[in-house]
């Protein structure tokens, strides 16, 4: 648990730029929740380096992360949910940095899956459905949904649709005719836990139909 | 103000078990854990345990595992100690104490709940 | 588990004197808390996270330390400062030093 130097042989260390970030995911793993860490300076020399996170722990002092290539990761059952660890990184029994964090404002959910598109022919509408795995935790249930979609040959025009819901119906008119279309969607916590988006989803394409010249209307895929 | 009150004294016989309680009023009563520290007469402070009032999950101190049971109601705002299996070397004050999750201090208490166990 | 002691068990001082009370950690802590209690009242929190004043605490209590040896420091007794004194570390399990009995003298 020590957070204090031990001896005077790491002065050269001490030079380097050991700034971190991390952050938690819940019931990632069943009951396992996860906290990643990695270097914010990618070119930081690793060998040596450990990551401990002590302290809002369940009957542990510590635990010790375990390192995968870029990143320090960490899978148990021991978080206790509540109020600020101490992460610190480390060599040997020595402290190099640290920082307090309350893992439940650093949460990534994890990215929607299932994503897809159907297009109503009746309705001149497309529905737009997902899914998460968050619907079936009992931590991170309330989450806020990023919608984003773009012509494809609009190569950074996105269209973002925030909602809380796993569905959403986009009106046809409000798309271009005959034109195909990339849709994506991640998550990020919006109630009692906070942090950042997950992953984008993976993309769903969809094709819009061409305008039928006696109605003014679309024509169905 | 913030403020803990908890239940009246208890007289047990040995064997037997007591269950303490803890109300909080004053604050949100699920940012906070709850924690339990007991004090036998004329001796120091013991932890004994803690609950996230959140979530229900729970940290012992190993030498009461076992024995000690922390449960909450959040739709009253109270915490509970149960300690079962009493020995007369329980006879203490039980003290409940908010703990400040930003430094893992205990910054409010209870008044405490004197238990006498005593055949 | 790391056990903390506290020393002296007791100290006899006069109103106005300077208290020094120890608490050494048998391995290195992060963290050191201080707190006082009076006959029959509950502990109240003076001292956390080493050096912060804890609400309502005045200016003449203070604390130093690092590693395994840490201090509360009473600049000028007052009468109402007579009382037993706990060091407890930060983290699980949270374990309290013996106490030190600061006495009129």
């Known amino acids: 648990e020590s957070g204090y130097a031990q001896n005077g042989d790491l002065e050269d260390a001490e030079l380097d730029d050991y700034s971190f970030s991390c952050y938690s995911q819940l019931e990632v793993n069943g009951s396992q929740h996860s906290l990643t860490c990695a270097f914010e300076d990618p070119d930081v020399n690793i060998t040596n380096l450990e990551f401990e996170i002590c302290g809002a722990l369940v009957e542990v002092k510590c635990l010790n992360f375990r390192k995968l290539q870029e990143i320090y990761f960490i899978e148990t059952k021991k978080f206790l949910l509540i109020g600020k660890s101490n992460i610190c990184v480390k060599v040997g029994e020595k402290s190099l940095t640290c920082k307090k964090i309350d893992l439940t404002t650093i949460v990534k959910p994890e990215a929607p899956f299932d994503l897809s598109v159907v297009y109503r022919e009746g309705a001149n509408d497309f529905v737009v459905t997902f899914n998460t795995s968050h619907l079936q935790k009992k931590y991170v249930k309330v989450l806020m949904h990023d919608v984003a979609y773009r012509q494809e040959k609009d190569e950074n025009k996105w269209t973002h649709v925030n909602l809380s819901s796993t569905k959403l119906t986009l009106l046809q008119r409000k798309l271009q005719p005959a034109a195909m279309y990339e849709i994506k969607v991640r998550s990020i916590p919006d109630h009692y836990f906070k942090g950042f988006w997950s992953e984008w989803s993976p993309s769903y394409y969809f094709r819009t139909p061409e305008i039928n010249n006696s109605s003014g209307e679309m024509d169905p895929i | 103000q913030v403020q803990l009150v908890q239940s009246g004294a208890e007289v047990k016989k040995p064997g037997a078990s007591v269950k303490v309680s803890c109300k909080a009023s004053?604050?949100?009563?699920?940012?906070?854990?709850m924690n339990w520290v007991r004090q036998a007469p004329g001796q120091g402070l013991e932890w004994m345990g803690l609950?996230?009032?959140?979530?229900?999950?729970?940290s012992y101190n190993q030498k009461f595992k076992g024995r000690v049971t922390l449960t909450r109601d959040t739709s009253i705002s109270t915490a509970y100690m149960e300690l079962s299996r009493l020995r007369s070397d329980d006879t203490a004050v039980y003290y409940c104490?908010?703990?400040?999750?930003?430094?893992?201090?205990?910054?409010?208490w209870g008044q405490g709940t004197t238990v006498t166990v005593s055949s | 588990e790391i056990v903390l002691t506290q020393s002296p068990a007791t100290l006899s001082l006069s109103p106005g004197e300077r208290a020094t009370l120890s608490c050494s950690a048998s391995?290195?802590?992060?963290?050191m808390h201080w707190y006082q209690q009076k006959p029959g009242q509950a502990p109240r929190p003076l001292i956390y996270?080493?050096?912060k004043l804890a609400s309502g605490i005045p200016a003449r209590f203070s604390g130093s330390g690092s590693g395994t040896d840490f201090t509360l420091t009473i600049s000028s007794l007052e009468p109402e400062d007579f009382a037993v004194y706990y060091c407890?570390?930060?983290?699980?399990?949270?374990?309290f030093g013996g106490g030190t009995k600061v006495e009129i003298k």
């Open positions: 996270e080493i050096s």
């Open positions: 609950i996230n009032p959140y979530n229900g999950v729970t």
């Open positions: 004053g604050y949100t009563f699920t940012g906070y854990t």
């Open positions: 104490a908010r703990g400040d999750g930003n430094y893992w201090y205990f910054d409010v």
């Open positions: 391995s290195s802590v992060t963290y």
């Open positions: 407890q570390e930060w983290n699980y399990p949270y374990t």
